[in-house]
C-alpha cells in the first residue's frame, strides 16, 4: 500500500486528530472518544467475553465428536473461525481506545484486522457447505447414505478455509501502517496505490462473494428445505430449521452495515459529507460485524433450552445435544417420508 486509502472499511479509516499522547498535542480537538467508537468498544468487550468462552466451549464439545459426527465437524469449524477472530479483539480494542493509534507494527496491521474478513469468508463458505449438506439430506437421502462421511466433510471444510484465505489476501496485501499528525500517530489502514478501480473491485467482490451471492443461494436453499418440511408437517424439523435460519439470518444482519458502508465509501468522493459520516461510523460497523463471532454459541444455547423445554442439563451436555446429533440413514432401503423427516430434524442448527 504505497498510498493509504481510507475508502474501504477494512478496519480503518482513521483520519481523526484526537490523541492520547502525554505531551501537549498541537490540535485542540477533544481527547474524548466519539460516540460510535465508545459503542464499538462496548460491543468488542462483550463479543470478546462471550465469543472466546462460548466458542471455546463449542470447540471443546465438538472436538471429541468430530471423528464420528458430521454435524460436529461443521460446528467445530464455525467455532474455530469465530474463536480466531475474537483473539484479535484486545488489539483492536486498544487501538480504538488510543484514538486509532496503532502501536503493534506492520505485520500485526496486515494480519489482525484481516481476521474478521477471514471469518466472514470462512463462515459464509462453511454455512454454504452446511446448507448444501442439509439440502442433500432432505432431497438426496440415498446419495447421503452412500457418500456422506466424515472424510468428505473435512475435505469440504478444507476447501472452504482455502477459499476464505484466498479471498482475504487483498485485505492482507493492501494493509499498511503509516504516520500522520502532530504529535505523530501511527495509523493502520488499506492502501490501493492510487488505484480507485482496484479499490472498488475489492469492495464489489467482497459484497458479491461475501454477501449477495450467499444471500441469494442460501435463501433459495432454505426456501426449498422449508417448503419440503412444511409439506410433510414435520413440526420438530421446523423447530430445528428455525435455528438454522437464525444462524444464517444473523450472519447477513450483522454484516449488512459493514457491506453497505464499504461499497458506498469506495464510490463516494472522500471529501463528501456522506463519506466523512460513514468514516466516523466505521469502527461501529466493524464491531457490529464482530457480533457474528459470538452469536452462534448463544443461538445453540437458546436452541438447546428450547429443545429441552427448560435448562435441566449442564451447558456442555446441552451443547452436545444440539451440536452432535447425527443425521445418518440407518436403514439402507426404506426411505419413507418419516425417515426423510427424521434426517431433516436431526441435522441440527447451522
Amino acid at each position: 500500500m504505497d498510498s493509504f486509502n481510507y475508502t474501504t472499511p477494512d478496519y480503518g479509516h482513521y483520519d481523526d486528530k484526537d490523541t492520547l499522547d502525554l505531551n501537549t498535542p498541537v490540535d485542540k480537538t477533544s481527547n474524548t472518544l466519539r460516540v460510535p467508537d465508545i459503542l464499538a468498544l462496548v460491543i468488542f468487550a462483550v463479543v470478546f467475553l462471550v465469543g472466546v468462552l462460548g466458542n471455546a466451549l463449542v470447540v471443546w464439545v465438538t472436538a471429541f465428536e468430530a471423528k464420528r459426527t458430521i454435524n460436529a465437524i461443521w460446528f467445530l469449524n464455525l467455532a474455530v473461525a469465530d474463536f480466531l477472530s475474537c483473539l484479535a479483539l484486545p488489539i483492536l480494542f486498544t487501538s480504538i481506545v488510543q484514538h486509532h493509534h496503532w502501536p503493534f507494527g506492520g505485520a500485526a496491521c496486515s494480519i489482525l484486522p484481516s481476521l474478521i474478513l477471514l471469518n466472514m469468508y470462512a463462515s459464509i463458505l462453511l454455512l454454504a457447505t452446511i446448507s448444501a449438506d442439509r439440502f442433500l439430506l432432505v432431497f438426496k437421502p440415498i446419495w447421503c447414505q452412500n457418500f456422506r462421511g466424515a472424510g468428505l466433510a473435512w475435505i469440504a471444510c478444507a476447501v472452504a478455509w482455502g477459499l476464505a484465505l484466498l479471498l482475504t489476501i487483498p485485505s492482507f496485501l493492501y494493509r499498511v501502517v503509516r504516520e500522520e499528525y502532530f504529535p505523530p500517530k501511527v495509523l493502520c489502514g488499506v492502501d490501493y496505490s492510487h488505484d480507485k478501480r482496484r479499490e472498488r473491485a475489492v469492495a464489489i467482490v467482497r459484497l458479491v462473494l461475501g454477501f449477495l451471492w450467499p444471500l441469494l443461494t442460501l435463501t433459495i436453499c432454505y426456501t426449498f428445505i422449508l417448503l419440503r418440511t412444511w409439506s410433510r408437517r414435520a413440526t420438530r424439523s421446523t423447530k430445528t430449521l428455525k435455528v438454522v435460519v437464525a444462524v444464517v439470518a444473523s450472519f447477513f444482519i450483522f454484516w449488512l452495515p459493514y457491506q453497505v458502508t464499504g461499497i458506498m465509501m469506495s464510490f463516494l468522493e472522500p471529501s463528501s459529507p456522506t463519506f466523512l459520516l460513514l468514516k466516523k461510523l466505521d469502527s461501529l460497523c466493524v464491531s457490529f460485524a464482530y457480533i457474528n463471532c459470538c452469536i452462534n454459541p448463544i443461538i445453540y444455547v437458546v436452541a438447546g433450552q428450547g429443545f429441552q423445554g427448560r435448562l435441566r442439563k449442564s451447558l456442555p451436555s446441552l451443547l452436545r445435544n444440539v451440536l452432535t446429533e447425527e443425521s445418518v440413514v440407518r436403514e439402507s432401503k426404506s426411505f419413507t417420508r418419516s425417515t426423510v423427516d427424521t434426517m431433516a430434524q436431526k441435522t441440527q442448527a447451522v
Partner: antibody, heavy 118, light 112 residues
Framework: QVQLRQSGPGLVQPSQSLSITCTVS????????VHWVRQSPGKGLEWLGV???????DYNAAFISRLSISKDYSKSQIFLTMNSLQTDDTAIYYC????????????WGQGTTLTVSS | DIVMSQSPSSLAVSAGEKVTMSCKSS????????????LAWYQQKPGQSPKLLIY???TRESGVPDRFTGSGSGTDFTLTISSVQAEDLAVYYC????????FGGGTKLEIK
Amino acid sequence: QVQLRQSGPGLVQPSQSLSITCTVSGFSLTSYGVHWVRQSPGKGLEWLGVIWSGGSTDYNAAFISRLSISKDYSKSQIFLTMNSLQTDDTAIYYCARNSRLGNCFDYWGQGTTLTVSS
Amino acid sequence: DIVMSQSPSSLAVSAGEKVTMSCKSSQSLLNSRTRKNYLAWYQQKPGQSPKLLIYWASTRESGVPDRFTGSGSGTDFTLTISSVQAEDLAVYYCKQSYNLPAFGGGTKLEIK
C-alpha cells in the same frame, strides 16, 4: 512514479493574494498528507502548513491568519492561498508529500518562485 | 514552539574526509507513544529542491548512500558523512516533526 508539479504566478503585488496549485501523480490524496514549505532568498526552509489525507489542516502559527490550504481529491490537486502579501513573502514555495513513516517530506515539488513587488 | 539550532553554519572539507554536523532541539523529540525520535535530515543541492536523507533520527531513506548516518536521541542529534564525495556539496537541514515542523538554520558543506 511519484511526482508533484507546481503552478502559480511569478509576480504578485503587495497586499494581493497568492494562489499556488500542486498537482500530484503516482499516489492518492486520500492516502497522504501534503505540506507547504517556503525558502526566502539566501535563507533557510520555513514550514507553512499541511493538509492531511482526511482533509484536516495544520498551520504554522505565524501564518494562520492569512494562509489556507485545500484540495480537490478528484483532480489530485492541493491549493495554497496566502493573503495580504508583503515583500518579505518573496520566496520559493514548495509542496511536499508527507512520508509514510517518520512524518517527513519524502517527495518535493520543483518549487514556485514568487516575487512580491510593486 | 520547538526551536532547532544547527552547528556549524558552514564547513569546508576535502573529499574522502569524515564530516559531522550537529542539531539541537529546544525540547525532546522522543515520542513516548511511538518510542521514536522525530528528527529528519535533508540535503539541498544548489538550485534543487530538498531531498530526504534520514528520518526517525537514524533511519536512512531508501536510495541514500550508506556513508550518511544519523544518530542521537532526545535533544541532541548528529549527521555524519563517513567519506565526503564531491557530489555532497550542499546545505544540510535538520527538521523536527514531533510537533508542528521546524527546520534548523542549515549547515553549508563546501568541498576544498
